[in-house]
Structures are given as structure tokens and as C-alpha cells.
């Protein structure tokens, strides 16, 4: 009779984590008598997987009724996979021996190989906000893959970047994988409302990529530019000043106004004017009752905004320019009118 | 292809504790052994020990209390320790690759690193 | 342990003739399997070993076919059919079947 030959007839199988393996295994004979056993890895370091005859094997089952007087499938089904049962399977003859079993072939092996799907991209900013045209870094992490080739791309608002590096750690041999990304941005004006996304590519993902976003909003600072203007007399010997801030971003915003240096009134914005880039508009005035200056006034807006050094923008009122009612009283008086609709928002 | 690249001091002093490391590149750490083994000048092979993948660990008896043999897959490294050195330690110490895929036994030592000398001396 | 014995200690060979080399157990290498652990391996100057054979007489990748090993249980054959200039060196057997892995002492082949 032909000699007994120990069939494996997988010689790769890969299984997604959380799932079933079933590593097949037939013998070509009944003889000799005694029982099969499983191992992964081969030599002296070899780990037991199955005894047909002893051993307590929670996760493994075999496929077949080994009971049965004539069976000759002795695959065994690993349930609930995960990288670590990663490994070179062996399904192992033995014949019967005293005291001991005596190894008498071993099947050419299975390759078992685990799918882990990678951990959802977590993108994240720098700490600090970053004005337009500076360079900002966003990371990327993934983690819990396996097998270790994955793809890693950037985009900001649909556009792919090319300005990044990316690692995938460990370097060597692992049950499973990280991937770690930088990508450097350079900020625009009109980058409020963009968005930073990382796009993960793996074999376990079947085509549709893992996606981790960012929003520059949360990045960006847009400083306002200033503009003081002086508008037609509202009443006689009364100037309305207007300071126009526009397209900052954030929102906060602290603005005062000084009269030829000396503080005389700070308001926070409130109601803002968005505008479609996502950056906003503020205005606020004051009457100026010239009529109580002798001398030209040199009105400044102040602005702080997100607690950056303060800007400014300063108008001078020339006085000369609004005679004086005759008869009017010219002693020293409140030159800014400051009733509460007098500093305004619009 | 494999390479085994081995680092570590040339120079120990009697008594304080070898340690070379073994960095494999260009493939796999899984389903192998990893040796190491020396040769003193002019003398034959000695097998110190081994470990597999899976970290397991065999030693040559006649070294076991003084050798540790340890794998840092994630580095594709592994390392041999050797306390208590004396002299008679001086030699060439390669690490190299077993492979394993048929039984209890070990199909060859395929793969060796160049070797690095270490002389024991005060 | 298992001791590995290996004769000759030296070997002077002529180039293009054949050599033999031989490596004695003190147990039987020949496992239940039907394997026989044991290998050879070839230490040219200055070099690291090179493993020739493994299992008795499976010649390993990229070795010539002028090696050839032959034997089982404790006897065991290297040889080589027509001796080239750059087989000069040492030649180990190692049985690979229980650990502590043995080597023999080597056979010095030289040319004549």
C-alpha cells in the first residue's frame, strides 16, 4: 500500500480579523494508526494548535467527525481571528508509540495571513492659529492594520498635496501596523471654510478609502484690515467717524477708540457681517462734536483681535474745517458724544 | 535579499557583560530562527543559542546561565547578552538565520552575518 | 549532547578530482519523519560559513552540483565531484536535529 501523505493543499489563506480560519488537512491513508496534531511553526519551537487525542482548544473545532472509523479530513476551523494567530500552520501525522506518539509527516504547511482594517484617520492641526501665507503642519494617524501596505493621500479641498511624509511603524515584523503622516499647508485668505483630509487605502477597505478631516477654520487667522473714514456732518458741528473692520476671522474682536491718544470708549464686536469666504465685517462709529475742540483731533481705532498685538488706523478731524456758531459756548466740553447709540455696529 | 548585520563592541573587560545585536534587513523576522554562533581564533563552530519568532528561546547548556537571547520584531532585531565574560569568550560572533518547515528539525542555517570579533581583555 | 565526529582533519585535493568528506554521529540524525538533520557547510577564508546542504543531501539555493550529500542515521557523506580552486577552506557538518545544535571539528580542504 502507498505510503501515507499528510495534504495541505492551501498554501496561503488570509482571514479578516473577527472571522473564522479553516486550514485544510487530509491524509491519503488510514495507516499507520495514531493520531494528527496541529502546530504552528516548524522545529523545536514549535507551538501546539490542536491534539486530536488531548489538550483543551477552546477556539478550535474540527470540520470533520474525527470519531468517525474511516475519516481522513482532519482540517481544523479557528474562530475569531486576530493578527496575532498570524503563522505557518502545520497539520502533523503521528504514529502511535509507547509511551510516547512518534511524528511520521507533517503536511508542507498553511500561510495564514490576518486582514486588520486600519483604525479611522484622526487628523489634527497645530496648536496655535496661523495667519495667510504661513506654512502649517496637520498629522495623520492610523493604527491596528495588518498586512502592513497601505496608502496615504492628502487633500485640501479636493486637491491632492504633494507636500507631505508619512511612516509606518513598526519597521519591522508586527501582528499589526501604524501609519503616522505630516502634510504642510500653506494658508490662504480664503481658507475659512477649506477642509484638510486624510485618505487611508488599505486591502481590508475594499476600494473605499477611510477619510479624516480637518478644518482650517480652526487654524486659520485672518487679521482685519482697517479703514477710518469721516462721514457727512449728521448735525451741526457733529462728524460721525466710521471704523470699517473687515474680513477677519475669528470672531473675536475688541475695538476702542482714542481721542488724540487717551481711551474713550471700547466695545467687543457683536452683531458681524459674514461674508461668503467665512470671514467677517464689523463697523463701528462715534460722533465727534467738533464745536468742543479748539485744536484738530487725531481719532485712532483700536483694534485687538483673537488676542493678538493690537492694530490700528488713525483719522485726523480737522477742526479749522467747522466754524463755530457764533455765540456758541467754548469752554472745554465733551468732545465725543457718548450716548449709547453713538458707538454702533452695522 | 536577507542580510544580517551584526553591531556591537569590539572590546569587553573580563567579567562585564557582551552585547551584540543583530539587525536583519531585506526580509521577514516570522517563521524563522535566529542564532547566534562564534568561533574562537582559529578553532572550530560553537552554536550558542537561538530564538524563534515567536520568542522562544534555546541555549547551549554549557552557556545558558551567562547568555539571553532576545527579538525586537519591530525593529527587525535581535540581541545576544553574555554575562560574566572571561577570555576564553574572545571570537567571531555571527548571527544568523535557521529555517524550519519540516517537523522538529531545522532545515539549515541559510543566511549568516559577516561576523564581528570581540576580544575579551583587561 | 550529540557529538559530531568528521574526517579527515585535512584534506589536500587536486583541482578536477573528486573529494570525500565524512561525518559520524553519536546518535542516529534520521528523525520519525524520515528526515535526516543534518547539514553541511563551507568556511572559505576569511568568510562566513555557507550552508551547502541541509536534511542530509538536499543540496541548498545557488550551491553547485558537485556537491552532493549522501548517508543516514549517524553516517553521513559530503562530496564533492571535481574539486574547483574556491571549494578551498573548512567544511562543517552540523546536525540540526535537537538542540544544542553540534558542529563537527571540520575538515580543512587544501590543494595540493
Known amino acids: 500500500e502507498e505510503e501515507l501523505q499528510v495534504i495541505q493543499p492551501d498554501k496561503s489563506i488570509s482571514v479578516a480579523a473577527g472571522e473564522s480560519a479553516t486550514l485544510h488537512c487530509t491524509v491519503t491513508s488510514l495507516i499507520p494508526v495514531g493520531p494528527i496534531q496541529w502546530f504552528r511553526g516548524a522545529g523545536p519551537g514549535r507551538e501546539l494548535i490542536y491534539n486530536q487525542k488531548e489538550g483543551h482548544f477552546p477556539r478550535v473545532t474540527t470540520v470533520s467527525d474525527l470519531t468517525k472509523r474511516n475519516n481522513m479530513d482532519f482540517s481544523i476551523r479557528i474562530s475569531n481571528i486576530t493578527p496575532a494567530d498570524a503563522g505557518t500552520y502545520y497539520c502533523v501525522k503521528f504514529r502511535k508509540g509507547s509511551p510516547d506518539h512518534v511524528e511520521f509527516k507533517s503536511g508542507a504547511g498553511t500561510e495564514l495571513s490576518v486582514r486588520a482594517k486600519p483604525s479611522a484617520p484622526v487628523v489634527s492641526g497645530p496648536a496655535a492659529r496661523a495667519t495667510p501665507q504661513h506654512t502649517v503642519s496637520f498629522t495623520c494617524e492610523s493604527h491596528g492594520f495588518s498586512p502592513r501596505d497601505i496608502t496615504l493621500k492628502w487633500f485640501k479641498n479636493g486637491n491632492e498635496l504633494s507636500d507631505f511624509q508619512t511612516n509606518v511603524d513598526p519597521a519591522g515584523d508586527s501582528v499589526s501596523y501604524s501609519i503616522h503622516s505630516t502634510a504642510k499647508v500653506v494658508l490662504t485668505r480664503e481658507d475659512v471654510h477649506s477642509q484638510v483630509i486624510c485618505e487611508v487605502a488599505h486591502v481590508t477597505l475594499q476600494g473605499d478609502p477611510l477619510r479624516g478631516t480637518a478644518n482650517l477654520s480652526e487654524t486659520i487667522r485672518v487679521p482685519p484690515t482697517l479703514e477710518v473714514t469721516q462721514q457727512p456732518v449728521r448735525a451741526e458741528n457733529q462728524v460721525n467717524v466710521t471704523c470699517q473692520v473687515r474680513k477677519f476671522y475669528p470672531q473675536r474682536l475688541q475695538l476702542t477708540w482714542l481721542e488724540n491718544g487717551n481711551v474713550s470708549r471700547t466695545e467687543t464686536a457683536s452683531t458681524l457681517t459674514e461674508n461668503k469666504d467665512g470671514t467677517y465685517n464689523w463697523m463701528s462709529w462715534l460722533l465727534v462734536n467738533v464745536s468742543a475742540h479748539r485744536d484738530d483731533v487725531k481719532l485712532t481705532c483700536q483694534v485687538e483681535h483673537d488676542g493678538q498685538p493690537a492694530v490700528s488706523k488713525s483719522h485726523d478731524l480737522k477742526v479749522s474745517a467747522h466754524p463755530k456758531e457764533q455765540g456758541s459756548n467754548t469752554a472745554p466740553g465733551p468732545a465725543l458724544a457718548s450716548a449709547a447709540p453713538l458707538g454702533g455696529s452695522g | 535579499q536577507v542580510q544580517l548585520q551584526e553591531s556591537g563592541p569590539g572590546l569587553v573587560r573580563p567579567s562585564e557583560t557582551l552585547s551584540l545585536t543583530c539587525t536583519v534587513s531585506?526580509?521577514?523576522?516570522?517563521?524563522?530562527?535566529w542564532s547566534w554562533i562564534r568561533q574562537p581564533p582559529g578553532k572550530g563552530l560553537e552554536w550558542i543559542g537561538f530564538?524563534?519568532?515567536?520568542?522562544?528561546?534555546f541555549y547551549n547548556p554549557s552557556l545558558k546561565s551567562r547568555v539571553t537571547i532576545s527579538l525586537d520584531t519591530s525593529k527587525n532585531q535581535f540581541s545576544l547578552k553574555m554575562t560574566s565574560v572571561t577570555a576564553a569568550d574572545t571570537a567571531v560572533y555571527y548571527c544568523a538565520r535557521v529555517r524550519a518547515y519540516s517537523g522538529i528539525g531545522l532545515d539549515g542555517t541559510d543566511v549568516w552575518g559577516q561576523g564581528t570579533t570581540v576580544t575579551v581583555s583587561s | 549532547d550529540i557529538v559530531m565526529t568528521q574526517s579527515p582533519l585535512s584534506l589536500p585535493v587536486t583541482p578536477g578530482e573528486p573529494a570525500s568528506i565524512s561525518c559520524k554521529s553519536s546518535?542516529?540524525?534520521?528523525?520519525?519523519?524520515?528526515?535526516?538533520?543534518l547539514d553541511w557547510y563551507l568556511q572559505r577564508p576569511g568568510q562566513s560559513p555557507q550552508l551547502l546542504i541541509y536534511?542530509?543531501?538536499n543540496r541548498a539555493s545557488g550551491v553547485p552540483d558537485r556537491f552532493s550529500g549522501s548517508g543516514s542515521g549517524t553516517d553521513f557523506t559530503l562530496k564533492i565531484s571535481r574539486v574547483e580552486a574556491e571549494d578551498v577552506g573548512v567544511f562543517y557538518c552540523?546536525?540540526?536535529?535537537?538542540?544544542?545544535?553540534?558542529f563537527g571539528g571540520g575538515t580543512k580542504v587544501e590543494i595540493k
Open positions: 536534511q542530509g543531501s
Open positions: 531585506g526580509g521577514s523576522i516570522r517563521n524563522y530562527y
Open positions: 552540523m546536525q540540526a536535529l535537537q538542540t544544542p545544535l553540534t
Open positions: 546518535q542516529s540524525l534520521l528523525y520519525s519523519n524520515g528526515y535526516a538533520y
Open positions: 530564538i524563534y519568532y515567536n520568542g522562544r528561546t
